[in-house]
């Protein structure tokens, strides 16, 4: 069971730069609540000297990245997936996560999110061209196939508890963080609140309950006067720079 499983947490705000992604620090190991079985690819490996970072889904990558196989046709047939730089507007896409913040995937192309045109939650039909080179693609012949999907597009900022894809989807003072098997808008941490210190280089993975990063002018540091026998269990809080 999960009692003995360690899942690596990923930094939400900043991640190391795989193939041109945003810079920052990846995660430290955290344990997950008992009573649930978690099955995920190779998330428990530590890849200290390995760049770019492997992933199983978009949520494990930074806000300017998405998870995919670097070579066409490899995904879905056991190919290694890594965090790739997001695609800018007018580039080909299969799903929203492939497009850079401020854009969404419409008709297989990354388009700018136009707040004036779509109310929150408007549902729009998108024809997605599936080239078989992404982890959502079916394993098989590598021939192009077209799939009609329906895209739920949010054009107002998410409030606390709203489902999100990246922090730019959330209102001010909130970030997009993992909760259970989804990602939701959670409050950015205030001074004195417990934070997760991401210190092990390259231990890039998944955490079932993610905290946001510390707010403006704050850093996640070991709490003063908090000395414990185990280095790894020291309490970190958001503190003034």
């Amino acid at each position: 069971t999960l009692n003995s499983v360690l899942i690596n947490s990923n930094a939400i705000k900043n991640l190391p730069p795989p193939l041109g992604g945003a810079g920052g620090q990846p995660g430290s190991a955290v344990s997950v609540a008992p009573g649930v079985l978690y099955e995920g690819g190779n998330k428990y490996q530590t890849l200290d000297n390995y760049q770019p970072y492997p992933c199983a889904e978009d949520e494990e990558c930074g806000s300017d990245e998405y998870c995919s196989s670097p070579s066409r046709g490899a995904a879905g047939v056991g190919g290694v997936q890594i965090c790739l730089a997001c695609r800018k507007r007018r580039k080909r896409c299969m799903r929203h996560a492939m497009c850079c913040p401020g854009n969404y995937c419409k008709n297989g192309i990354c388009m700018p999110s136009d707040h004036s045109h779509f109310p929150r939650g408007e549902i729009e039909e998108s024809i997605i061209e599936n080239l078989g080179n992404d982890h959502n693609a079916a394993a098989g012949d590598g021939y192009p196939r077209r799939t009609t999907l329906t895209s739920k597009i949010y054009h107002t900022k998410g409030q606390e508890g709203s489902v999100c894809l990246r922090s730019s989807d959330c209102a001010a003072g909130l970030c997009c963080a993992r909760h259970f098997w989804s990602k939701i808008c959670k409050p950015v941490l205030k001074e004195g609140q417990v934070c997760t210190k991401h210190k092990r280089k390259g231990s890039h993975g998944l955490e079932i309950f993610q905290r946001c990063y510390c707010g403006e002018g704050l850093a996640c540091r070991i709490q003063k006067d908090h000395h414990q026998a185990s280095n790894s269990s020291r309490l970190h809080t958001c503190q003034r720079h």
Epitope: E57, K152, P187
Partner: antibody, heavy 117, light 111 residues
Framework: EVKLVESGGGLVKPGGSLKLSCAAS????????MSWVRQTPEKRLEWVAS???????YYPDSVKGRFTISRDNVRNILYLQMSSLRSEDTAMYYC???????????WGQGTSITVSS | DIVLTQSPASLAVSLGQRATISCRAS??????????MNWFQQKPGQPPKLLIY???KQGSGVPARFRGSGSGSDFSLTIHPVEEDDTAMYFC?????????FGGGTKLEIK
């Protein structure tokens, strides 16, 4: 319109197997986590399994090793493969998802399973 | 697991009056600045419908008559004024910890 339609329920003997399906439409299926929740004849609701958009799976102790949740992101179908079924698995099985907020805000109509000899 | 205890198990309220259902958790369901408590309504032969999430936020298309309140481990759902159509089972559910758990339900009848 968001639609979740379950199928595959029926009568099965203890120790038997069954595979449930949930056909999803009206949203980008691959972007969202999906779950199975069951309701016992006594009307008690129980979480059964969940799967993230990328395919990571989660189970409670009561079903792990017996049930397997999976998804087909091309055909937009969620599955629940159930084996070693017990009488206490008798329930209405619903598939559900969280599209707008973290809670399960969309549910299918359910499919009924009876485990009895 | 977090145990949710709902009370009363059933209640009958006159049309136009106030119905209050309570849900107590075995431990706090607050985390990350959010109370992870939800309320569902279920009518006979139908799936549960989300009414309230994050203790007090209304789900899509839910009338303002349904109000959620509380934090920590004590929560309540208030329906006012009660309408004929509100006859149903009401469940609380926590999403703070895995496994997510549900209360035993409260049956509301309209007099």
């Amino acid at each position: 319109e968001v639609k979740l339609v379950e199928s595959g329920g029926g009568l099965v003997k203890p120790g038997g197997s069954l595979k449930l399906s949930c056909a999803a439409s009206g949203f980008t299926f691959s972007n969202y986590a999906m779950s199975w929740v069951r309701q016992t004849p006594e009307k008690r609701l129980e979480w059964v399994a969940s799967i993230s958009g990328g395919g990571d799976t989660y189970y409670p102790d009561s079903v792990k090793g017996r049930f397997t949740i999976s998804r087909d992101n091309v055909r937009n179908i969620l599955y629940l493969q159930m084996s070693s079924l017990r009488s206490e698995d008798t329930a209405m099985y619903y598939c559900a998802t969280s599209l707008e907020n973290y809670a399960m805000d969309y549910w299918g109509q359910g499919t009924s399973i009876t485990v009895s000899s | 697991d977090i145990v949710l205890t709902q009370s009363p198990a059933s209640l009958a309220v006159s049309l136009g009056q106030r119905a209050t259902i309570s849900c107590r958790a075995s431990e706090s369901v607050d985390d990350f600045g959010i109370s992870f408590m939800n309320w569902f309504q279920q009518k006979p032969g139908q799936p549960p419908k989300l009414l309230i999430y994050a203790a007090s936020k209304q789900g899509s298309g839910v009338p303002a008559r349904f109000r959620g309140s509380g934090s920590g481990s004590d929560f309540s759902l208030t329906i006012h004024p009660v309408e004929e159509d509100d006859t149903a089972m009401y469940f609380c559910q926590q999403s703070k910890e895995v496994p997510p758990t549900f209360g035993g339900g409260t049956k509301l009848e309209i007099k």
